[in-house]
């Protein structure tokens, strides 16, 4: 299971408890909160990570303008219900029987309701726009160097197939990373763009989910890339359903 045998740890998820209690003393790691065994050779699903966290945050425009249907995660942390595969259940409820529907990255996509609320399916987030602002530097980064470094990061650190990094846009000091992954494109074993984006978000915040690795040290041609603001927009395969009251607020 690629949990480090010698000291029995999970390189890709520090929110686990690992024990040499598998057959023959094999190391096996379980996610905090859910108790589900995790595959330490790849990223753990965002739902299991959130559950674990709750048991133990102009001219010549080339930047993407998020669509009117783009969602931002304004609700913050909650203790999610995960399905047997570790994915978010379509309907989430809190202890006071307030319920809402979420997308595949766990972001609310409907108004809140009561226990009678129905969420027929888990709607897939197929397009994620990561909007970063970097700290001032002597000069702008070279766009192609920046593009190459961010693609390398998602490929090597987050194990995301390069075809899912659709584009990297740069207009100093704003960087935008576009991740796209349709249901039909995602093969068995592929890292989900939602999971990769969540690991990246936590890295950027200095809250790395990787075991024992130093924090994220992003450099472009040796120059540190320090992020001072992050916004993530989520676009679903089916537009969200909010009341007009919210849309005009």
């Amino acid at each position: 299971h690629t949990a480090a045998q010698d000291n029995c740890t999970c390189p890709t998820n520090k929110m686990t408890v690992c024990s040499p209690d598998g057959p023959g003393g094999r190391c096996q790691c379980r996610a905090l909160g859910s108790g589900m065994a995790v595959d330490c050779s790849t990223l753990t699903s965002k739902c299991l990570l959130l559950k674990a966290r709750m048991s133990a945050p102009k001219n010549a425009r080339t930047l993407v303008r998020p669509s009117e249907h783009a969602l931002v995660d304004n609700d913050g942390l909650y203790d999610p219900d995960c399905d047997p595969e570790g994915r978010f259940k379509a309907r989430q409820c809190n202890q006071t029987s307030v319920c809402w529907c979420v997308n595949s990255v766990g972001v609310r996509r409907t108004d809140k309701g009561d226990l009678s609320l129905r969420c027929d399916e888990l709607v897939r987030t197929h397009h994620i726009l990561i909007d970063l602002r970097h700290r001032p530097t002597a000069g702008a980064f070279n766009h192609s160097d920046l593009d190459a470094e961010l693609r390398r990061l998602f490929r090597e650190r987050y194990r995301l197939h390069p075809k899912f990094v659709a584009a990297v846009h740069y207009e100093q000091p704003t960087i935008q990373i576009e991740l796209r992954q349709n249901t039909s494109q995602k093969a068995a074993g592929d890292v989900d763009i939602g999971d990769a984006a969540y690991y990246f978000e936590r890295d950027i915040k200095g809250e790395s989910l990787f075991q024992g690795r130093g924090g994220l040290d992003l450099r472009v041609r040796g120059e540190p890339l320090q992020v001072e603001r992050t916004l993530i927009y989520y676009l679903d395969e089916i537009p969200p359903k909010f009341s007009m009251k919210r849309l005009t607020a």
Partner: antibody
Framework: QVQLQQSGPELVRPGTSVKMSCKAA????????IGWVKQRPGHGLEWIGN????????NYNENFKGKATLTADTFSSTAYMQLNSLTSADSAIYYC????????WGQGTTLTVSS | DIVMTQSPSSLTVTAGEKVTLSCKCS????????????LTWYQQKPGQPPKMLIY???IREPGVPDRFTGSGSGTDFTLTINNVQAEDLAVYYC?????????FGSGTKLEIK
């Protein structure tokens, strides 16, 4: 070899509480989960919860939240379970077990709640 | 919670026979990440604590006679006892450790003629 030695039988009054122990030997206590299981005649086996002494991580079956409290003392390699507000429904054999493969079980502690 | 259903609840066999015990689960116990089935079989003899026989659905514990075999995947699992012996008189339980809370089946009581 691995052993889990549980404390002796208990006869207690309804409404009181009891604390039973499970002393581990023969392995590194802090590296394995210890689970607790209830067995009543005609009710089979019920998983109460578990504790990881190496980090004091604890999980409870919802049915036993507020009823059972799990703790561990790493110095004496002993796990404890306290049961409170006892009723006749709590009369049972309680087992501690090292979870995972090669699961080792204690011999059980018989709890009788009677007035 | 995952519900574990065992059948039959009891059976009586003659020594030397082959026995098949069933355990069905309300959801799959096959973890898509680790590709293991998180199902355990226990044997409990009268007056004793349960003893682990099979882990991860099919891995026999050290010291368990090879006449005990675990099989199955997903939601349907089987414990097969070949050439049943008098000392196999016991209650057999399945348990999952897929996710919390771990739950047990209600058991199958094996009696020998």
């Amino acid at each position: 070899q691995v052993q889990l030695q549980q404390s002796g039988p208990e006869l207690v009054r309804p409404g009181t509480s009891v604390k039973m122990s499970c002393k581990a030997a023969g392995y590194t206590f802090t590296k394995f989960w210890i689970g607790w299981v209830k067995q009543r005649p005609g009710h089979g086996l019920e998983w109460i919860g578990n504790i990881y002494p190496g980090g004091a991580y604890i999980n409870y079956n919802e049915n036993f939240k507020g009823k059972a409290t799990l703790t561990a003392d790493t110095f004496s390699s002993t796990a404890y379970m306290q049961l409170n507000s006892l009723t006749s429904a709590d009369s049972a054999i309680y087992y501690c077990a090292r979870e995972g493969s090669s699961g080792y079980w204690g011999q059980g502690t018989t709890l009788t709640v009677s007035s | 919670d995952i519900v574990m259903t065992q059948s039959p609840s009891s059976l009586t066999v003659t020594a030397g026979e082959k026995v098949t015990l069933s355990c069905k689960c309300s959801q799959s116990l096959l973890n898509s990440g680790t590709q293991e089935n998180y199902l355990t079989w226990y044997q409990q003899k009268p007056g004793q604590p349960p003893k682990m026989l099979i882990y991860w659905a099919s891995i026999r514990e050290p010291g368990v006679p090879d006449r005990f075999t675990g099989s199955g995947s997903g939601t349907d699992f089987t414990l097969t006892i070949n050439n049943v012996q008098a000392e196999d008189l016991a209650v057999y339980y399945c348990q999952h450790d897929y996710s919390y809370p771990f739950t047990f089946g209600s058991g199958t009581k094996l009696e020998i003629k």
